[in-house]
Interface confidence: medium
């Protein structure tokens, strides 16, 4: 159900009864001549468009009967000046879309008593206006003058939307708001114009920090970027690695994809220890054995886990017969005392 709301306004401006006669040419107060003093009130009937306007009910869009507004000829001010019970313009509220056409009947009637405003007595009729019109919604008044020879009625009319209603038929509703259900003002056609920082049909969706990842970030108010579980960073575009992940990366949260040369659940096991740390000394050959371990193959003359220790070939005292020993890189040399010779001075010259 689409609710719409507007009001047809009819402004009675001036009525002229030149001779003070009724429609049947009788004098309003009886007798044959003036002053007739027609105490004039009006019946207004607003109805759907009819090619031939019938003054008979029903007044499908509304009806109104005014109090006595003047005698014979008179002008009518705007507002409620004449009578507290009468407001000019006369308002006909609409709870449905304005169709753009209408029929209007305005009858000027006479009464002897201000309390007797019966409209059924044809003897009281001064004049009757019937018209049908096309009318678009707008603030501008349409002016009209109805002349019947003895009477003139000047009036104007318009159809305006109620506050917060827009569009050709006043069927577009828009009321500015700034709360949980919307942050917007209204455009000329009733379109919702989101306040800065808001978007969506009802302007309830905050616009997050520019650059905020639309999958992994969100916001409750404009300019924020809150990360969903497993994501981090100013724009929530960095995944959070598996806790304890050391030399790994992630494409999705809680991954630990090891960098080259690393292994294990936390990528903390060095698979290329030889290259990264060069632990073997003195020209030894390094071999990775996995899980962050290695072995060094020492060159002759060196020992130790990292070949960091030079082998002392004189340690076992190889030289005989009191010869002195000199340690060389991969061997030793014996300096023989007089009378001895040989590799370890084991031979006697004697």
């Amino acid at each position: 159900q689409v609710w719409s709301s507007g009001v047809f306004e009819l402004k009675l401006q001036e009525f002229v009864n030149k001779k003070g006669l009724l429609g049947n040419r009788n004098c309003c107060r009886g007798g044959s001549g003036p002053p007739c003093a027609c105490r004039t009130f009006f019946r207004v009937c607003l109805k759907h468009y009819q090619a031939s306007v019938s003054p008979e009910p029903p007044c499908t869009y509304g009806s109104a009967v005014t109090p006595v507004l003047g005698v014979d000829s008179f002008s009518l001010p705007d507002g409620a000046g004449i009578d507290p019970a009468f407001s000019n313009p006369i308002r006909f509220p609409f709870g449905f879309t304005w169709p753009g056409t209408f029929s209007l009947i305005i009858e000027a009637l006479h009464t002897d008593s201000p309390d007797d405003l019966a409209t059924e007595n044809p003897e009281r009729l001064i004049s009757r206006l019937t018209t049908q019109r096309h009318l678009t919604v707008g603030e501008e008044w349409s002016q009209d003058l109805h002349s019947s020879g003895r009477t003139d009625l000047r009036y104007s009319y318009r159809f305006v939307c109620d506050e917060h209603y827009y569009g050709e038929g006043c069927s577009v509703f828009c009321r500015p708001r700034d709360d949980a259900f919307g942050h917007f003002t209204c455009g000329d056609r009733g379109e919702k114009m989101c306040d800065p920082g808001w978007k969506g049909q009802y302007c309830t969706d905050p616009i997050c920090l520019p650059g905020c990842d639309d999958q992994h970030g969100y916001c409750d108010k404009p300019g924020e970027c809150k990360c969903r579980v497993g994501w981090q960073g100013r724009y929530c575009d960095e995944c959070i690695r598996y806790p304890g992940c050391l030399h790994g990366t992630c494409q999705q949260p809680w991954q630990c994809n090891c960098q080259e040369g690393w292994g294990g659940l936390f990528c903390n096991q060095d698979l290329n220890y030889c290259t990264h740390h060069k632990p073997c000394r003195n020209g030894a050959t390094c071999t990775n054995t996995g899980q962050g371990s290695y072995t060094c193959s020492c060159r002759p003359g060196y020992t130790g886990a990292n070949c960091e220790l030079e082998v002392d070939e004189c340690a076992p005292s190889p030289c005989k017969n009191g010869a002195s020993c000199t340690d060389l890189e991969d061997s030793f040399s014996c300096t023989c005392p007089p009378g001895f010779y040989g590799k370890v001075c084991e031979l006697s010259a004697m």
Partner: antibody
């Protein structure tokens, strides 16, 4: 005088349905939001959902989304809460309340409330 | 959803006492906070809207203050008819949420 009158409460079995009405009078129905708020026995207030009768825009709490539907008939100045697939935890007094929204005041509050209608979901 | 946490959950006071109830929002809600009073078996009544504006017809002993995340309802001089449960409510972000309530009892 502004008045909101709820009706339609009662005892219903789990899985059943019930329709609550909220008849409004004394104000222009289409100029306000109408909200439904419930209160389980001995508990606090919980917002159920709301409607803007002028354009039919609705919003719901996650706990009732897909089960409850709010509507309004502007010719009768009445809002409705259609409750389907009812559960024991839906047992509560259901209030309808009027909310004026005014861009000058963030958080205008619910200024008129109905007397409430009790909904009991039990087998 | 935004959580509204009221403290204390209950308090005992005497007629004439100054009573303060606080409400903390889990995130910034500007001044979009209303306070309600509820008596047993009755519907809530609006006391304060937009954090600090006294609703029409509410006695001036009630006042509200705060913005952002911290809000306060103060009753300057407690009267016998003020013994009730008080709720705060935010309407800054959907869905609107209420505090759990503060019961003010006679000491």
């Amino acid at each position: 005088e502004v008045q909101l009158v709820e009706s339609g409460g009662g005892l219903v079995q789990p899985g059943g349905s019930l329709r609550l009405s909220c008849a409004a009078s004394g104000f222009t129905f289409t100029s306000y939001d109408i909200h439904w708020v419930r209160q389980a026995p001995g508990k606090g207030l919980e917002w159920v959902g709301g409607i803007s009768p002028a354009d039919g825009d609705t919003d719901y709490a996650n706990s009732v989304k897909g089960r409850f539907t709010i509507s309004a008939d502007t010719s009768k100045n009445t809002a409705y809460l259609q409750m389907n697939s009812l559960r024991a935890e839906d047992t509560a007094v259901y209030y309808c309340a009027r909310n004026d929204y005014d861009v000058r005041f963030v958080g205008s509050g619910m200024d008129y409330w109905g007397q409430g209608t009790l909904v009991t979901v039990s087998s | 959803d935004i959580q509204m946490t009221q403290s204390p959950s209950s308090l005992s006071a005497s007629v004439g006492d100054r009573v303060t109830i606080t409400c903390r929002a889990s995130q910034d809600v500007s001044t979009a906070v209303a306070w309600y009073q509820q008596k047993p078996g009755k519907a809530p009544k609006l006391l304060i809207y937009s954090a600090s504006f006294l609703y029409s017809g509410v006695p001036s002993r009630f006042s509200g203050s705060g913005s952002g995340t911290d809000f306060t309802l103060t009753i300057s001089s407690l009267q016998p008819e003020d013994f009730a449960t008080y709720y705060c409510q935010q309407s800054f972000t959907a869905p609107p949420t209420f505090g759990q309530g503060t019961k003010v009892e006679i000491k």
